[in-house]
Each structure stands twice: as structure tokens, then as C-alpha cells.
């Protein structure tokens, strides 16, 4: 028994004076606590306790369930203990079958012994199955068997406490180990859409998916820069033992412009936190914004192709699109498609394919688009570049030579004189009159130019060339002259 120096409070003394006592089932347990300041006896086994205010604890007919730790405490709070085993061959184990373990922590299989002298106190798998190879345990007859560093793989493991008694193996009731996983990574969070665009009054609903090893992961929707509690609804599922998924749905039944902003889905566990955001934009009404992908004034050569391309933002979705030329609607030659297949896409592309354009097909091409809220349009002015064409070349009654040419851009007409039989006409002749005539065709059509020279200036046989040209090309017409005496005669003009 402990001894202390006089004057200092000492712990109580217990008789019998030993740390452990073994009695047989049916025998008497008699424990005496000696202390002038005796307060109580306390009995403990498997977290259950019992108290006795008498200084002598007597159990006349001991049962296996009387196995446990008996502690005597005095008024100074000092105590002394004795552990009593009540040996009962028919009940070798006391058990608390609830068995829960946290991953990586130790957990106690609560099967204390009633007889410390049995051998081979250990764990065994149910139905003769072996225990996991890496399962380590430490037996303690007074407490049970401690499983060291519980693994996730032990979840739902069925086991027994086991001892050898008289050469035979005796098993306790079965235990099923439930393992609560430890968080070893932050939760995985994702959101149904990264951005939302709504009109006032429409419902905003966004779902955050949180994935983790257990349902004790915390999650919430927050509005950035706001403390307002948001209305959210949860659903969750266990996909197997350590694969938990929660869906947290945030809803604003009638969104307002001032609800616009960034919403964060936040999740955390004991390892750390993760978040994902979504942006809400609420507009008072829909809109359409058109962006031409090429210049709205287009120059194209005769016979070539051109694509008129626009991108446009439309919210809500576009309902009607059309391309128009000269009050006529194109039924084909155009296509309209979303810029991306993303569900939140509001950007679209429309293309009009003009092929082998003729000089007569210049003009204004208009793209029109509408949705339930607004209409919008954009016009392209298309000019078809054409090589000059000489429409007429005549000798007029007043002796003028006249050349009329049409083309786009506006042709320039130059005159040349070729003396005698020379093939090259190099000497230029200044025109007397140049006029740009109004075309009777559609706007954006060919431009007509008329140029005249005075034929009386020519004194020798030769050829006069009328040359019309622009950026696209050139065309010439010729007048042949021959003199008979003093008379000049125009031979047939030719090109």
C-alpha cells in the first residue's frame, strides 16, 4: 500500500492489498476501503459505473458481470483501485458489441476477460475467414483488444474476440466494425453552370455538387460580399461506402436586377476547403447585339464569291432570322448556328453565301434578327467590281468620235492615235468632253462614262483607240481612218 509523509493527505488503502483479484463465479467479493475521510466506492466496466457509499463493498454471489475496476476515493479526491476478475467458464468475455473506428485512429474491441489466465487472447475473423494481413492489435484483458490504426478497408469487417481455454478456442459474440473515413483531401465541388443570364422575374436555380468520403462534409451557398442567408435545398447519396455526393440547389424564385452578382458554393472538411462560383446577370429586358465579322462595305470582283458573316448576342434565344436583298428574302444560301454548344451560350453566327456574283447583283444585303423582346438589323453594301464594257463607239454627225463604257469602279477612258499601219497606239489624244452618266440599273451597279474627241484633229491615215479601264481590267475599241483627197472617211469601228 502507498505510504506518504505525515501531514500530507494519503490515498485510501484497500484490502486485499493487491492490484488484481481473481474470484470464482458464485464466490463472495469482499473489499474493504480504509480511510478516515472515506467518500465512496466506484465500480467501472465497459463505461458503466456503479457507486457504493459503504466503506466495505460486498457482493455475496459474484457473477461474471461483477468483473471490473473497483475504486475507493476519499474526501481529498485521492483514490486507490483493485481490479476484480470473476472467473466464469461459461462467460469468458464481457462485451459491448458497438464497434466504431475512425480511419487512422485506434479503436477498442470491447471484450474484457473474466479470467486473466486463459491464453492466446486475440481477434479472429468470422466464419473462419482470416483477418486482413495488415491488421495489428494489442490485447488488454481488462479493457479489450485495441485495433491499431484502423484502415478504410476494415469497414464492415466481422470479427470475434478469441481465447484458448483448456486447449479449445472460445469465441465471443461477433463484432462488426464500422469505419468512419478520415478526410484526406478537400471536397470536390462543381457547379451546374458557370454563368446565368435571366430576365427580371425569371427563376434562378443553380446546383452545386459536393463529393467527399462521408456525409459530414459541410457545404453552403454564399453570395460574395453579402451575409444574407440563402435558401438552399439538399439531396445526397452514398455511392458505396466512401463515396458521398450531395447536391445543394440554390433558388431565387423571382430574380431581380439587384440579385445580379457572384454566388459561391463553399465546402469544407477537416482537411481543408474548396469553392466554385457562378455568375448571375439579371437584365430588365432582353437584347440583341450584332457584330459584323467583315466590313459592312464589301467590294467583290465579278464572278467571285463572298460570305457576309455576322455574330450576334441574343437573349432570350433568337426566334426569327432572315437575309434580305432588294425586298426579297433569301430562302437558301445562308446558315445560322450557335457559336458554342454550351447551354448558356447567347452568341450566334449567321452567314450568307453569295456565289459567282454578277455586276447586277451589287446592293444592300440586310440581316434581320428578332427574339421575344427586341428586333435588330445590320446592312452590308456590296459593290461588284466589273471590267469595263464599251457600250457604244460612234462617229457623230458633228464629227465627234464618242465612246461610252460601263464598269465598276468607274472606268477611265483614254484616247490614242496610231499613225499609218503602226500596231501600237501611243500618242494620246485629249478628250473634248467626258461625262459620267446615270445608270438605269440598280444602285451599286456599273457606272457609265461617256468620252468624246474631235476627229477633225486627225490629218493622216491611221487608227484611233478608245481604251476604257479600271482596277479590274481594260477594254478597247478602234476607229480606222483613210483620206481620199481632202475628204476623211471613217472606216467601220472595231474592237
Amino acid at each position: 500500500q502507498p505510504s506518504v509523509s505525515p501531514g500530507e493527505p494519503s490515498p485510501p488503502s484497500i484490502h486485499p492489498g493487491k492490484s488484481d483479484l481473481i474470484v470464482r463465479v458464485g464466490d463472495e467479493i469482499r473489499l474493504l476501503c480504509t480511510d478516515p475521510g472515506f467518500v465512496k466506492w466506484t465500480f467501472e466496466i465497459l463505461d458503466e459505473t456503479n457507486e457504493n457509499k459503504q466503506n466495505e463493498w460486498i457482493t455475496e454471489k459474484a457473477e461474471a458481470t461483477n468483473t471490473g475496476k473497483y475504486t475507493c476515493t476519499n474526501k481529498h479526491g485521492l483514490s486507490n483501485s483493485i481490479y476484480v476478475f470473476v472467473r466464469d467458464p461459461a462467460k469468458l468475455f464481457l462485451v459491448d458489441r458497438s464497434l466504431y473506428g475512425k480511419e487512422d485512429n485506434d479503436t477498442l474491441v470491447r471484450c474484457p476477460l473474466t479470467d486473466p489466465e486463459v491464453t492466446n487472447y486475440s481477434l479472429k475473423g468470422c466464419q473462419g475467414k482470416p483477418l486482413p494481413k495488415d491488421l495489428r492489435f494489442i490485447p488488454d484483458p481488462k479493457a479489450g483488444i485495441m485495433i491499431k490504426s484502423v484502415k478504410r478497408a476494415y469497414h464492415r469487417l466481422c470479427l470475434h474476440c478469441s481465447v484458448d481455454q483448456e486447449g479449445k478456442s472460445v469465441l465471443s459474440e461477433k463484432f462488426i466494425l464500422k469505419v468512419r473515413p478520415a478526410f484526406k483531401a478537400v471536397p470536390v465541388v462543381s457547379v451546374s453552370k458557370a454563368s446565368y443570364l435571366l430576365r427580371e422575374g425569371e427563376e434562378f436555380t443553380v446546383t452545386c455538387t459536393i463529393k467527399d468520403v462521408s456525409s459530414s462534409v459541410y457545404s453552403t451557398w454564399k453570395r460574395e460580399n453579402s451575409q444574407t442567408k440563402l435558401q438552399e435545398k439538399y439531396n445526397g447519396w452514398h455511392h458505396g461506402d466512401f463515396n458521398y455526393e450531395r447536391q445543394a440547389t440554390l433558388t431565387i424564385s423571382s430574380a431581380r436586377v439587384n440579385d445580379s452578382g457572384v454566388f459561391m458554393c463553399y465546402a469544407n472538411n477537416t482537411f481543408g476547403s474548396a469553392n466554385v462560383t457562378t455568375t448571375l446577370e439579371v437584365v430588365d429586358k432582353g437584347f440583341i447585339n450584332i457584330f459584323p465579322m467583315i466590313n459592312t462595305t464589301v467590294f467583290v470582283n465579278d464572278g467571285e464569291n463572298v460570305d457576309l458573316i455576322v455574330e450576334y448576342e441574343a437573349f432570350p434565344k433568337p426566334e426569327h432570322q432572315q437575309w434580305i436583298y432588294m425586298n426579297r428574302t433569301f430562302t437558301d444560301k445562308w446558315e445560322d448556328y450557335p457559336k458554342s454548344e454550351n447551354e448558356s451560350n447567347i452568341r450566334y453566327v449567321s452567314e450568307l453565301h453569295l456565289t459567282r456574283l454578277k455586276g447586277t447583283e451589287g446592293g444592300t444585303y440586310t440581316f434581320l434578327v428578332s427574339n421575344s423582346d427586341v428586333n435588330a438589323a445590320i446592312a452590308f453594301n456590296v459593290y461588284v467590281n466589273t471590267k469595263p464594257e464599251i457600250l457604244t463607239y460612234d462617229r457623230l454627225v458633228n464629227g465627234m468620235l464618242q465612246c461610252v463604257a460601263a464598269g465598276f469602279p468607274e472606268p477611265t477612258i483614254d484616247w490614242y492615235f496610231c499613225p499609218g499601219t503602226e500596231q501600237r497606239c501611243s500618242a494620246s489624244v485629249l478628250p473634248v468632253d467626258v461625262q459620267t452618266l446615270n445608270s438605269s440599273g440598280p444602285p451599286f451597279g456599273k457606272l457609265v462614262v461617256q468620252s468624246s474627241i474631235d476627229s477633225s484633229a486627225f490629218k493622216h491615215n491611221g487608227t484611233v483607240e478608245c481604251k476604257a479601264y479600271n482596277d479590274v481590267g481594260k477594254t478597247s475599241a478602234y476607229f480606222n481612218f483613210a483620206f481620199k483627197g481632202n475628204n476623211k472617211e471613217q472606216i467601220h469601228p472595231h474592237t
Partner: antibody, heavy 123, light 107 residues
Framework: QVQLVQSGAAVKKPGESLKISCKGS????????IGWVRQMPGKGLEWMGI????????KYSPSFQGQVTISAGKSISTAYLQWSSLKASDTAMYYC????????????????WGQGTMVTVSS | AIQLTQSPSSLSASVGDRVTITCRAS??????LAWYQQKPGKAPKLLIY???SLESGVPSRFSGSGSGTDFTLTISSLQPEDFATYYC?????????FGGGTKVEIK
């Protein structure tokens, strides 16, 4: 034996405060969670919240958060449920219960129940 | 919060009958479900924990099954002392909600 003994019935007026108790015995009080459950007359059971006397960690149902306070005195093995301002709708039977072994109050179940405390709030 | 829906809300049966009560969770709760019995004027009593584990001292005619969202309490042969109200409770995540209860009455 293991038991939870609750304080006696209480009759109060609206606006008054009240603290009811639940004393545990026969087991190591600090090693188990203690929960509180409400049962309004003729109705079902409602989980209010839970406390771990060992460190006073407390978890509340959102329906009761801010309405009641759960506390514990571990040296006297007692858990408490209190109201600062009672309402007529607080009239109910209140049970305390021990949450059998689990982890952090999950899993397991309420294996030991108190006898209940009837709280009547009437003007 | 996880909602638990019990069905039926009440039933009439005779002594010796096999009785089945179901509890459906609004989301998966693994096997974290308990069943309680409550008699008028008494505190509830634990029958089953972890969906299928029989509490010590509870007669073996009571059994529990299920996992995930659907759970069942079965009384294999109803005894006179079994007429009571039965509640399920999930202990998978906070708040630890109860079902609405099933009253088992004498036919």
C-alpha cells in the same frame, strides 16, 4: 444501472425563462453524447440537438438553433436545455437521451432515454 | 435536412401477425438508421441500430434491414406488448431527423 433522470414538470408563462436538467448515472457521462428530443402533444419525435459533455461540443437542428441552449456540467454528470423566453408553442414533452457509441454523434442511436419532462407554457 | 417518410402511418394487426414498417430517406444514409418503440406516456425505447443490429435485450422477433434510402422494420410474430408507435431515425448526418411514426393497433 445506466440511467438518465430528468427534472420534474414545469408550468410557465410566455416570456419566462426555463432550464430543465438531465442527470446521468451508471456510466462514464463524459464519454457519450446527450441529445434532446421534443414531442409535442399527440405528435412525433423531433431531434433538437446534441452535446458531448467531455468538451461541450454542441450541434443543433436548424429548427431549434437560436431558440434553445444546450449545455452540460460534466463534474455533476448533468445536461441542460434552456429557454430565455418561452412561447406557448414550446408546450411539449422533452426527452434527453444518450447517444450510443458512434463517431462525433453520427451512426449509433439513442440507447438510453430519460423519463421526459413536461413543459407547459400558458398565460 | 434529410427527410424520413414512414409508411404506413398506422396499421391494424392481430397477435401472431407478421408486421412490416418501411422508412424511406430523402437521400442515401448508408446504414445509419435506428428504430424505436414508444408506448403511450413512456419514453421511446431503442430496438435496432445501424439498420439491422438488434439492441441488447430486444426480442429476436424484431429485425431491421435496408441500406441507402429504403429500410424496413419487421416484427415476425406480433405480441400483445408490441402494440405501440414505431419511429425510425437517421444518424447519418445532422440534424438527426426522425420519421413521422407508425402506430400499430390491435385489429
Amino acid at each position: 444501472q445506466v440511467q438518465l433522470v430528468q427534472s420534474g414538470a414545469a408550468v410557465k408563462k410566455p416570456g419566462e425563462s426555463l432550464k430543465i436538467s438531465c442527470k446521468g448515472s451508471g456510466y462514464r457521462f463524459t464519454s457519450y453524447w446527450i441529445g434532446w428530443v421534443r414531442q409535442m402533444p399527440g405528435k412525433g419525435l423531433e431531434w433538437m440537438g446534441i452535446i458531448y459533455p467531455g468538451d461541450s461540443d454542441t450541434k443543433y437542428s436548424p429548427s431549434f438553433q437560436g431558440q434553445v441552449t444546450i449545455s452540460a456540467g460534466k463534474s455533476i454528470s448533468t445536461a441542460y436545455l434552456q429557454w430565455s423566453s418561452l412561447k406557448a408553442s414550446d408546450t411539449a414533452m422533452y426527452y434527453c437521451a444518450r447517444h450510443g457509441r458512434g463517431y462525433d454523434g453520427y451512426e449509433g442511436a439513442f440507447d438510453i432515454w430519460g423519463q421526459g419532462t413536461m413543459v407547459t407554457v400558458s398565460s | 435536412a434529410i427527410q424520413l417518410t414512414q409508411s404506413p402511418s398506422s396499421l391494424s394487426a392481430s397477435v401472431g401477425d407478421r408486421v412490416t414498417i418501411t422508412c424511406r430517406a430523402s437521400q442515401g444514409i448508408s446504414s445509419a438508421l435506428a428504430w424505436y418503440q414508444q408506448k403511450p406516456g413512456k419514453a421511446p425505447k431503442l430496438l435496432i441500430y445501424d439498420a439491422s443490429s438488434l439492441e441488447s435485450g430486444v426480442p429476436s422477433r424484431f429485425s431491421g434491414s435496408g441500406s441507402g434510402t429504403d429500410f424496413t422494420l419487421t416484427i415476425s410474430s406480433l405480441q400483445p406488448e408490441d402494440f405501440a408507435t414505431y419511429y425510425c431515425q437517421q444518424t447519418n448526418s445532422y440534424p438527426l431527423t426522425f420519421g413521422g411514426g407508425t402506430k400499430v393497433e390491435i385489429k
